[in-house]
């Protein structure tokens, strides 16, 4: 169908509550484009009827609420005047009871659900809520170990819990809760946040931290286009270089002739205490020779790799 396939990282989600995912892939979505969502390679688009539990809302796919059976790979197709991209998003739904201590922690939690407070400082936690404009969010309530947070040291301001004079006792399991209203119906959103305490005043030492990838394999079909971001946090004054290598050679040099695999242009976002750098690697067309090779992201002395692997055959199709 002429669409380029792009594989995004997994999203791990909680059942029985609303969830939304926005299909944006700059610079593709910055112009005049149409966006259509599909589930599990279905030819039938996701409904745009707002009464449907799962429906497309502008560029978003919206689950009201998410259910156990919604796990799977969703595709959004972005069609421009001269281009077509298909973005694959793997959604995994789990049953999580935030106040049930017998249930272990969650695997691969994103940074939004793992936050740090700095000992002895005034700091804050953020409740990350990503929903389209059609969803009206109410004020946020905060809980620690399932009890609503009260006290002079804690103040709620918009999506943040301000914590003054952070102490070691502030580590633990937090949750932020908001009521979401959509088409007159109300839903509860509850995000769990694991909070750790650090004594470091600044963002950290001079060793860069690779947030993604995490030394793992990525299932990808032969012949598809794949873009993988390397996300690195580092101090503002760092002089570290960030790059992608294969067989201990810069990918741009290794694939100098074919230019089939290229390193992207580095971008960064400046935060108060650190920078977040992103440099991607693009596989224009995945070939058999790419499987099993560690593609290494380097950031100063830090490294992390991805290994491409063929998807396991789906015997249900036979």
């Amino acid at each position: 169908d002429g669409c380029k396939d792009i594989f995004m990282k997994n999203e791990i989600l909680s059942a029985s509550q609303p969830f939304a995912f926005n299909c944006t892939f700059p610079p593709i979505t910055s112009g005049e484009v149409s966006v259509t969502w599909y589930k599990n390679s279905s030819k039938i688009p996701v409904s745009k009827i707002i009464q449907s539990r799962i429906h497309q809302d502008e560029t978003w796919i919206l689950f009201l609420p998410m259910e156990w059976g919604d796990s799977g790979v969703y595709q959004c197709v972005i069609k421009g005047r001269d281009s077509c991209h298909r973005i694959h998003v793997n959604l995994t739904v789990f049953e999580k009871h935030w106040c049930d201590t017998s249930i272990g922690g969650l695997p691969n939690l994103s940074d939004e659900y793992k936050q740090i407070l700095h000992l002895g400082k005034d700091d804050s936690l953020t409740c990350h809520l990503h929903f389209p404009k059609s969803c009206v969010l109410g004020p946020i309530k905060w809980y620690k170990d399932c009890n609503e947070i009260k006290g002079e040291r804690f103040t709620v301001l918009e999506t943040r819990l301000l914590v003054s004079n952070v102490s070691a006792e502030d580590r633990g399991n937090y949750a932020c809760q908001a009521i979401l209203t959509h088409s007159g119906k109300q839903y509860e959103v509850l995000n769990g946040i694991t909070v750790s305490i650090t004594e470091r005043a600044g963002y950290g030492g001079s060793v860069p931290k690779i947030i993604y990838p995490k030394n793992h394999s990525i299932e990808v079909q032969l012949g598809t286009t794949l873009i993988v971001d390397c996300n690195v946090t580092d101090t503002k004054d760092n002089t570290n270089l960030r790059c992608w290598r294969v067989n201990n050679t810069l990918v741009d040099d290794y694939y100098d002739e074919s230019k089939r695999i290229r390193e992207g242009v580095e971008t960064h976002v400046s935060f108060r205490e650190h920078n977040l750098y992103t440099v991607n690697i693009t596989f224009l067309e995945v070939k058999m020779e790419d499987y099993g090779l560690p593609f290494m992201c380097h950031a100063g002395v830090s490294t992390a790799y991805i290994i491409l692997q063929l998807p396991a055959p789906d015997f249900r199709a036979y």
């Epitope: 804050s124 990350h128 004020p139 943040r160 963002y203």
Partner: antibody, heavy 117, light 112 residues
């Protein structure tokens, strides 16, 4: 429909006190903080402070501590602001404004205070 | 306290043309969570202020998409793509990063 209905204009003498009200309707009063904002003639907006109607705890801008006292009556879904030891500089329009998922999402119509001898 | 700076007046604009209003903060409003805690309000003549944009670029439901917000950590712009008569008034920026919450002095949008 969310509404914040403020009390009417006040004309008071220097040194006196005044208590203005802000009656909330159309939402659960105790779920949202209530802010108070001052707009003096020819000046910008100034945040005075805010109160958590559920617990009654208030936070003030340093320069309004001792000048403003914020209280609520949960049974009446009403927030109050008392201003003490009034001077001519206190002449202004005072707004109540709700905050929740974002700050100042709904505003009252304003209460005009005139301090004059 | 964080000081918010705005010009008192914008350049007079014609109906149907675009307008830009600027605001500057004395400290970066970009939090380590990646969110920029800046809001824009419009106070029309004889009315109370009205929230237009929150967290720098998020349009409040019901506000026309002629309005958009952008900026860096300390320099912010409110853009109105096609100015209408009802857009006349004073535009205030405000920071919600930390207490005390502070406003800019307001910029008056005037028509040619």
């Amino acid at each position: 429909e969310v509404q914040l209905q403020q009390s009417g204009p006040e004309l008071v003498k220097p040194g006196a006190s005044v208590k203005m009200s802000c009656k909330a309707s159309g939402y659960t009063f105790t779920d949202y903080h209530m802010n108070w904002v001052k707009r003096s003639p020819g000046k910008s907006l100034e945040w005075i402070g805010r109160i958590n109607p559920d617990y009654g705890d208030a936070r003030y801008d340093q320069k309004f501590k001792g000048k403003a006292t914020l209280t609520v009556d949960k049974s009446l879904s009403t927030a109050y602001m008392q201003l003490n030891r009034l001077t001519y500089e206190d002449s202004a329009v005072y707004y109540c404004a709700r905050d929740g998922y974002y700050v100042f999402d709904y505003w009252g119509q304003g209460s005009t205070l005139t301090v004059s001898s | 306290d964080i000081v918010m700076t705005q010009a008192a007046f914008s350049n007079p604009v014609s109906l149907g043309t675009s307008a830009s209003i600027s605001c500057r903060s004395s400290k970066s409003l970009l939090h380590s969570d990646g969110i920029t805690y800046l809001s824009w309000y419009l106070q029309r003549p004889g009315q109370s202020p009205q929230l237009l944009i929150y967290r720098m670029s998020n349009l409040v439901s019901g506000v026309p998409d002629r309005f958009s917000g952008s900026g860096s950590g300390t320099d912010f712009t409110l853009r109105i793509s096609r100015v209408e008569a009802e857009d006349v008034g004073v535009y205030y920026c405000a920071q919600t990063l930390e207490f005390p919450l502070t406003f800019g002095a307001g910029t008056k949008l005037e028509l040619k």
